[in-house]
């Protein structure tokens, strides 16, 4: 797995470089996670044809994966920094159960899956420090998450492959939207 941001050899070799600002650190963290997702998607798409055929193969997707909407204030039109930040943090917290599901779903990229999960936890911490209105952030119910995880893990192989593909695709889209929004803050 790649080395987490701030721990690569270049950072060690350049001790006089200015320390990263909070925004730069968040930006770097998201890009690191996106790199990890790309590697996981590569394995998923090589293993099955889910990536090409997911649209035709599904009538309905009730996974409730977090998604950015106009009301969340993260798009250029109607941009609202505080509302958007709350949405990003809430969304990442909601994604955590799906990232837990991804563990043990990969053969050659097992470390990568763990790195994505742990890096997301760190990203949430960075963002929580940045947020002023932490009370507005709702944490998912652990009991609900546990039963969802059980249900997802009980699916057959084909459905598990499809679930994996959909989680990675949605998480990538969510992080890309978050990255664009955070660059406006």
């Amino acid at each position: 797995a790649p080395v987490p941001p701030g721990e690569d050899s270049k950072d060690v070799a350049a001790p006089h470089r200015q320390p990263l600002t909070s925004s730069e650190r968040i930006d770097k963290q998201i890009r690191y996670i996106l790199d990890g997702i790309s590697a996981l998607r590569k394995e998923t798409c090589n293993k099955s044809n889910m990536c090409e055929s997911s649209k035709e193969a599904l009538a309905e997707n009730n996974l409730n994966l977090p998604k950015m909407a106009e009301k969340d204030g993260c798009f250029q039109s109607g941009f609202n920094e505080e509302t958007c930040l709350v949405k990003i943090i809430t969304g990442l917290l909601e994604f955590e159960v799906y990232l837990e599901y991804l563990q043990n779903r990969f053969e050659s990229s097992e470390e990568q899956a763990r790195a994505v999960q742990m890096s997301t936890k760190v990203l949430i911490q960075f963002l929580q420090k940045k947020a002023k209105n932490l009370d507005a952030i709702t944490t998912p119910d652990p009991t609900t998450n546990a039963s969802l995880l059980t249900k997802l893990q009980a699916q057959n192989q084909w459905l598990q492959d499809m679930t994996t593909h959909l989680i990675l695709r949605s998480f990538k889209e969510f992080l890309q939207s978050s990255l664009r929004a955070l660059r406006q803050m």
Partner: nanobody, 124 residues
Framework: DVQLVESGGGVVQPGGSLRLSCAAS????????MAWFRQAPGKEREFVAV????????YYADSVKGRFTISRDNAKNTVYLQMNSLRPEDTALYYC?????????????????WGQGTLVTVSS
């Protein structure tokens, strides 16, 4: 486990109607998305229609849209397929399938439980 038993197949003339039934037993029926697939001789099993858990939403293959209607009665643990304006190309073995998943598939591999099938023959 879930057991599925189809009935209602038979021989019908082109333009005629049939109503297939699928009786389920075993688990909580209302938790399952229920689908109908069909397989003509020498062809792959193909999606016909699916109904969501509570029966609120239905989806159909383009080839049967407007002619076939899927419905369910959770009190009777039964799913139905009303087939109208039948055509010779509708001739096939019709299977009922069930799955308990947040994903509702149109692909046969997205289903865990299958019936034995009921034969529908459309011929003059």
């Amino acid at each position: 486990d879930v057991q599925l038993v189809e009935s209602g197949g038979g021989v019908v003339q082109p333009g005629g109607s049939l109503r297939l039934s699928c009786a389920a037993s075993g688990r909580t029926f209302s938790n399952y998305a229920m689908a109908w697939f069909r397989q003509a001789p020498g062809k792959e099993r193909e999606f016909v229609a699916v109904i969501s858990y509570a029966g609120g939403r239905t989806y159909y293959a383009d080839s049967v849209k407007g002619r076939f209607t899927i419905s369910r009665d959770n009190a009777k643990n039964t799913v139905y397929l009303q087939m109208n304006s039948l055509r010779p190309e509708d001739t096939a073995l019709y299977y009922c399938a069930a799955v308990d998943s947040p994903l509702i598939a149109t692909h046969p591999r997205g289903y865990d439980y299958w019936g034995q099938g009921t034969l529908v023959t459309v011929s003059s």
